[in-house]
Interface confidence: low
């Protein structure tokens, strides 16, 4: 017959206690069971003890009591009691869980990244969680994006969950960058930082500043500016091929313009001094980002003397 779910001494789905207090949690069940605990509550911790005993009528039930002395804010999380796999039960594991907030006025966030941001990898169009969960469900948290944006939870695309943080159901390029969760407790402002990182391979556009055939007098300097436009956080490699490449005639300078809030603009400027006849021909700027590839070329003609 199916086992009854194990029963926890604390009822409901969540419980709030103060940091420094002792957590007592008993699990009573019809079979042997195990505890699943938040990562920071390691089973070997000196402040944690689990005692097992027989209990109930005729001592036929299984009980275990979890005691966590001087509970800390970072012990906040799910505490669950689950049956070990029981052959007679069709369900592999039956469990009961409770989320325990360990409130600390000096530490509103369970994980604090105040100096160095934690990196979160994101994919556009997918769910993104900014995991600034809190030590008390009553704390009001604001999500900000550097430098000036505030991301407002609307209950649909952006949802606040005190156990998880901010859940963004359909992440866009707007969520790329430095995101900060802020909470004010007793007049003190607390911040925890996250750096969202997305790698894309899209190349929007590649241009050479003078795409028409370039006409140049011998001895003059050739300057070709290749511009690649990409979405934010896309990285590109830009290379040139040209007639006298084997002699490394050209010097190439590169720079990135990240001032645009929607795109990165990569510049590669090719310069050849004192152009000669052997420098005439096809100049190609190649742009690669992962599997994506685009190129653009222009022809360069050399003339001995000016003509009318």
């Amino acid at each position: 017959s199916k086992l009854k779910d194990p029963e926890l001494s604390l009822k409901g789905t969540q419980h709030i206690m103060q940091a420094g207090q002792t957590l007592h949690l008993q699990c009573r069940g019809e079979a042997a069971h195990k505890w699943s605990l938040p990562e920071m509550v390691s089973k070997e911790s000196e402040r944690l003890s689990i005692t097992k005993s027989a209990c109930g009528r005729n001592g036929k039930q299984f009980c275990s009591t979890l005691t966590l002395n001087t509970a800390q804010a970072n012990h906040t999380g799910f505490y669950s009691c689950k049956y070990l796999a029981v052959p007679t039960s069709k369900k592999k594991e039956t469990e009961s869980a409770i989320y325990i907030f360990i409130s600390d006025t000096g530490r509103p966030f369970v994980e604090m990244y105040s100096e160095i941001p934690e990196i979160i990898h994101m994919t556009e169009g997918r769910e993104l969680v900014i995991p600034c969960r809190v030590t008390s469900p009553n704390i009001t948290v604001t999500l900000k994006k550097f430098p000036l944006d505030t991301l407002i939870p609307d209950g649909k695309r952006i949802i606040w969950d005190s156990r998880k943080g901010f859940i963004i159901s359909n992440a866009t390029y707007k969520e790329i960058g430095l995101l900060t969760c802020e909470a004010t407790v007793n007049g003190h402002l607390y911040k925890t930082n996250y750096l969202t990182h997305r790698q894309t391979n899209t190349i929007i556009d590649v241009q050479i500043s003078t795409p028409r055939p370039v006409k140049l007098l011998r001895g003059h300097t050739l300057v070709l500016n290749c511009t690649a436009t990409t979405p934010l956080n896309t990285r590109v490699q830009m290379t040139w091929s040209y007639p006298d490449e084997k002699n490394k005639r050209a010097s190439v300078r590169r720079r990135i313009d990240q001032s645009n809030s929607h795109a990165n603009i990569f510049y590669s400027v090719l310069t050849i001094d004192k152009m000669q006849n052997k420098d005439k021909g096809l100049y190609t700027c190649r742009v690669r980002s992962g599997p994506s590839f685009k190129s653009v070329n222009t022809s360069v003609h050399i003339y001995d003397k000016a003509f009318i």
Epitope: I116, P117, H197, R235, V236, Q237, R254
Partner: antibody, heavy 125, light 108 residues
């Protein structure tokens, strides 16, 4: 499976040259900066050189500046170290290493999370 | 040039806590990394950004930083933790990666 495999090591006379290669697989090589680190027999780790994801920025230890050149070919998923004017004190196992995620390289450096098994360079007459 | 100072060796009794320090006059403004290297093997990153553990590294390993000293703590040292440990920082002023001299950890 993520792998970094160094090659090109061997015995070379003082003043000679060697080119080390590091073939990367199992990840998008062009997303990450990379380094060369060496270890002389019985000694500690010594950083040699580093290069940004695109190859635009390169960095060198004072002991190798002007003699060694780091470069990469992202189309071949390969990192290189060209070593010229080699000296006896350059004798070491040379490791290539991939940087940890560095979306804004200049702001935060998080170390190297994957290393090759190393290639031995011996400089001796 | 920038230098990081580590003790040459540290001994610890089995299942006791081991602490390895790394000192540098400007370490407070850098992010410190720690590597474990066993004989004949490549180094393994055990702590990055002062106190963060890469996936797969046991919870016994933790890092901290106070003033000009970074510390690697192995809370319940095991025989398999015997290795050389190196601290590392990025020195922004010279644009160089710097390693400490290494510490040999012996588990008694």
């Amino acid at each position: 499976e993520l792998q970094l495999v160094e090659s090109g090591g061997g015995l070379v006379q003082p003043g000679g040259s060697l080119r080390l290669s590091c073939a990367a697989s199992g990840f998008t090589f062009s997303d990450y900066s990379a380094s060369w680190v060496r270890q002389a027999p019985g000694k500690g780790l010594e950083w040699v050189s580093a290069i940004s994801w695109s190859g635009d920025s390169t960095y060198y230890a004072e002991s190798v500046k002007g003699r060694f050149t780091i470069f990469r070919d992202n189309s071949k998923n390969t990192l290189y170290l060209q070593m010229n004017s080699l000296r006896a004190e350059d004798t070491a196992v040379y490791y290539c290493a991939k940087s940890w995620a560095t979306p804004i390289e200049s702001l935060y450096y998080y170390g190297s999370d994957y290393w090759g098994q190393g290639t031995l360079v011996t400089v001796s007459s | 040039s920038y230098e990081l100072t580590q003790p040459l060796s540290v001994s610890v009794a089995l299942r006791q806590a081991a602490k390895i320090t790394c000192g540098g006059n400007n370490i407070g403004s850098q992010t410190a990394q720690w590597y474990q290297q066993k004989p004949g093997q490549a180094p393994v990153l055990v702590i990055y950004a002062n106190n963060r553990r890469p996936s797969g590294i046991p919870e016994r390993f933790s890092g901290s930083k106070s003033g000009n000293t970074a510390t690697l703590t192995i809370s319940r040292a095991q025989a398999g933790d015997e290795a050389d440990y190196y601290c590392q920082v990025w020195d922004a002023s010279t644009q160089a990666i710097v390693f400490g001299g290494g510490t040999k950890l012996t588990v008694l």
